[in-house]
Amino acid sequence: SSSPTSSASSFSSSAPFLASAVSAQPPLPDQCPALCECSEAARTVKCVNRNLTEVPTDLPAYVRNLFLTGNQLAVLPAGAFARRPPLAELAALNLSGSRLDEVRAGAFEHLPSLRQLDLSHNPLADLSPFAFSGSNASVSAPSPLVELILNHIVPPEDERQNRSFEGMVVAALLAGRALQGLRRLELASNHFLYLPRDVLAQLPSLRHLDLSNNSLVSLTYVSFRNLTHLESLHLEDNALKVLHNGTLAELQGLPHIRVFLDNNPWVCDCHMADMVTWLKETEVVQGKDRLTCAYPEKMRNRVLLELNSADLDCDPILPPSLQTS
């Protein structure tokens, strides 16, 4: 491991600070944990692919960026990063691919500057509802998190608890309304079948939402109305069949939105007429000329933008007496 020192070439001190009466102490010389690489100038500690089973206790106080990727952490207990003095500077924490299957309540407590958290590629069978909020109060202290990256955190089928995975994740996102300041949320590649209807309404600051590569069939009960800051919505590679009028109107009403809809199995029947009309008029869908029908068979690979109302028919439903076996 390397531990660059704050040699005679640089000098740290507590400067005049006009906005606060708190006096900051000069940081003490910091050691680099075993099996880690440290750069004080980059305020970065990398403990990568080291098969660590727990978070190092002797992290330097200067750390702003902490990479703990490719390890074997298994469980993040409460206060996993709590230190004396606290890691007051830690802003970006990457725990991806570290075989985490349990994140307990308060795992990220005592990290007052944590802005970006990446838990991707961990099989999170047990994500506490209070993993991010830290307490079970109905309204918690606001989390400083601005970006939360939770791509591919779905555990294998046989390791899931007897509960909805979507529900478990959403409970953690909504607990205590702690994540009201969240601006980026990535939930790609999680086999989500649905999006609980209340989740987006309680994340009003979202700018970027990535739900790509899931199994979402419908957005009928999902409201985007409150997401007035939303800039990008990634819905590629899902199982969407059609977007209905209510959803279309809400998306159109968002002032900065860009929507990505590629690689969904669009069903081009009479229910698609409103969406086709909207696609022809809207500027919010990126790459809209690439959207093609998947069903019915006769419509496969037809470009949505090239369809007209005559193309979009529904086979009549025969009354029971006329149906043949």
Epitope: S2, P4, S6, S7, S9, S10, S12, S13, S14, A15, P16, F17, S20, V22, A24, P26, P27, E37, S39, E40, A41, A42, R43, T44, R64, N65, A88, E89, A91, A92, S113, R115, Q116, V146, E147
Partner: antibody
Framework: QVQMQESGPGLVKPSETLSLSCTAS????????MNWVRQSAGKGLEWIGD????????TYNQKFKDRASLSVDKSRNWASLRLASVTAADTAVYYC???????????????WGPGVQVTVSS | EIVMTQSPDTLSVSPGETVTLSCRAS??????LHWYQQKPGQSPRLLIK???QSISAFPARFVGSGSGSEFTLTINNMQSEDVAVYYC?????????FGQGTKVDIK
């Protein structure tokens, strides 16, 4: 978008104190370290030091530590550099810069002010 | 302090050519090496971070490589708008230090 703007006198007399300020906008000021870098024909780009706007902790290049003083006023998204006892060798363009597109401070600068030319002369 | 040395000091190339700029650190800095482009009368702009990570504002013809103490910036298919001074920067150890720059212009 993220912007920085330096200001200060373009001419300073030898032995006096150079005083510059930098106003930042378009991001959360306390999230990112503020750096000062100068550029002169003779010495190229030189990093003077940085300050954490959250707590006022500074790190200085040893070359400047006895003469430089950095401070911030986070209520005004404002940072300042004072450089004492200047000589003609301190004639340079002075920049404030930050890493404000990314959350961790990573020892590089992706947002720079336009710079302010300072000449030390009597 | 870590001394950054760039070579050559100046380079004159024809449009469409490939340009190779070198940067050497006086000791290992892992991949904490950043490149900047500075055009006349402008501030430096971050071009490549961490030795090889591109910045979206710049075209893909700018490619960084290297690790440890030897680094290279390659400009493929040189264009007239690439005329500038290119600086490398140590981001590993305090004080942060820059190379003296390589000036690239068109023949």
């Amino acid at each position: 978008q993220v912007q920085m703007q330096e200001s200060g006198p373009g001419l300073v007399k030898p032995s006096e104190t150079l005083s510059l300020s930098c106003t930042a906008s378009g991001y959360t000021f306390t999230d990112f370290y503020m750096n000062w870098v100068r550029q002169s024909a003779g010495k190229g780009l030189e990093w003077i030091g940085d300050i954490n706007p959250n707590n006022g902790v500074t790190t200085y290049n040893q070359k400047f530590k006895d003469r430089a003083s950095l401070s911030v006023d986070k209520s005004r998204n404002w940072a300042s550099l004072r450089l004492a006892s200047v000589t003609a060798a301190d004639t340079a363009v002075y920049y404030c810069a930050t890493g404000a597109i990314h959350y961790g401070y990573d020892g590089y600068f992706d947002v720079w002010g336009p710079g302010v030319q300072v000449t030390v002369s009597s | 302090e870590i001394v950054m040395t760039q070579s050559p000091d100046t380079l004159s190339v024809s449009p469409g050519e490939t340009v190779t700029l070198s940067c050497r650190a006086s000791q290992s800095i892992s991949d904490y090496l950043h490149w900047y482009q500075q055009k006349p009368g402008q501030s430096p702009r971050l071009l490549i971070k961490y030795a090889s990570q591109s910045i979206s504002a710049f075209p893909a013809r700018f490619v960084g490589s290297g690790s440890g103490s030897e680094f290279t910036l390659t400009i493929n298919n040189m264009q007239s708008e690439d005329v500038a001074v290119y600086y490398c920067q140590n981001g590993h150890s305090f004080p942060l230090t820059f190379g003296q720059g390589t000036k690239v212009d068109i023949k």
